[in-house]
Amino acid sequence: APVPPGEDSKDVAAPHRQPLTSSERIDKQIRYILDGISALRKETCNKSNMCESSKEALAENNLNLPKMAEKDGCFQSGFNEETCLVKIITGLLEFEVYLEYLQNRFESSEEQARAVQMSTKVLIQFLQKKAKNLDAITTPDPTTNASLLTKLQAQNQWLQDMTTHLILRSFKEFLQSSLRALRQM
């Protein structure tokens, strides 16, 4: 598994470096998770041909994965720091059930899948400290999540491979959009 942010050799070699700001820590954390997703996607793409699937095939999948929209305030048109931050946190909380689903989906990258899941939990904590309007953040219902997880795990092999691919791709895109917006804040 990769070394968590703040513990790589470069940091050890530079003891007099200024401590990271909250924004820098969040930035580094997201890039760390993106690295993890890259490694997981590599295994997925090597194992199946899902990565070459057409967008039509992906669109047919009825997963309700979080996605950025104009109304969320994270794009330049209609950019709104607080609305956007709420969307990012809410989206990450919604992704957690899908990251749990990924836990048994990898052979050689099992630790990496766990690292992505745990790092996302840490990222949520960082972002919650940054948010002023925590009341606006809706936490997913555990019962609904549990039944969704059961449903996903009951799919046939092809659908499970497709689901894994879709989750990784969507999570990557969500994090990229989130980080781009966070870099404006």
Epitope: M68, Q176, L179, R180
Partner: nanobody, 124 residues
Framework: QVQLQESGGGLVQAGGSLRLSCTVS????????MGWFRQAPGKEREFVAD????????WYADSVKGRFTISRDNAKNTMYLQMNSLKPEDTAVYYC?????????????????WGQGTQVTVSS
């Protein structure tokens, strides 16, 4: 290491247009976020615009909004900057850059590879 090559710069009168291109070598072009920056003599390099991998997240500096348009063609490994209603203050060397994380942003440190730059001069 990714290679970037800008082209399309030149001398143009105020009010005129130019279209800059940035061609990238490397098969993972379509996963990169890309940005345009510019640097006038004696000034710091400043953000102009950036674009994500599938062109659905574009950002512009306030100074160019409504006049410049960033776009990309993943099949051609090329990014563009259409510059209209040019002003003398747009005079600078224009650089393209890539962010391999696919994020982009308004600071040079967010990007890991840069082109050599192309000169744009707007005369009054």
């Amino acid at each position: 290491q990714v290679q970037l090559q800008e082209s399309g710069g030149g001398l143009v009168q105020a009010g005129g247009s130019l279209r800059l291109s940035c061609t990238v070598s490397g098969r993972t072009f379509s996963t990169y976020a890309m940005g345009w920056f510019r640097q006038a003599p004696g000034k710091e390099r400043e953000f102009v615009a950036d674009i994500n991998w599938n062109s659905d997240n574009l950002w512009y500096a306030d100074s160019v909004k409504g006049r410049f348009t960033i776009s990309r063609d993943n099949a051609k490994n090329t990014m563009y900057l259409q510059m209209n209603s040019l002003k003398p203050e747009d005079t600078a060397v224009y650089y393209c850059a890539v962010d391999s994380y696919g994020v982009g942003g308004g600071k040079p440190e967010y990007y890991d590879s840069w082109g050599q730059g192309t000169q744009v001069t707007v005369s009054s």
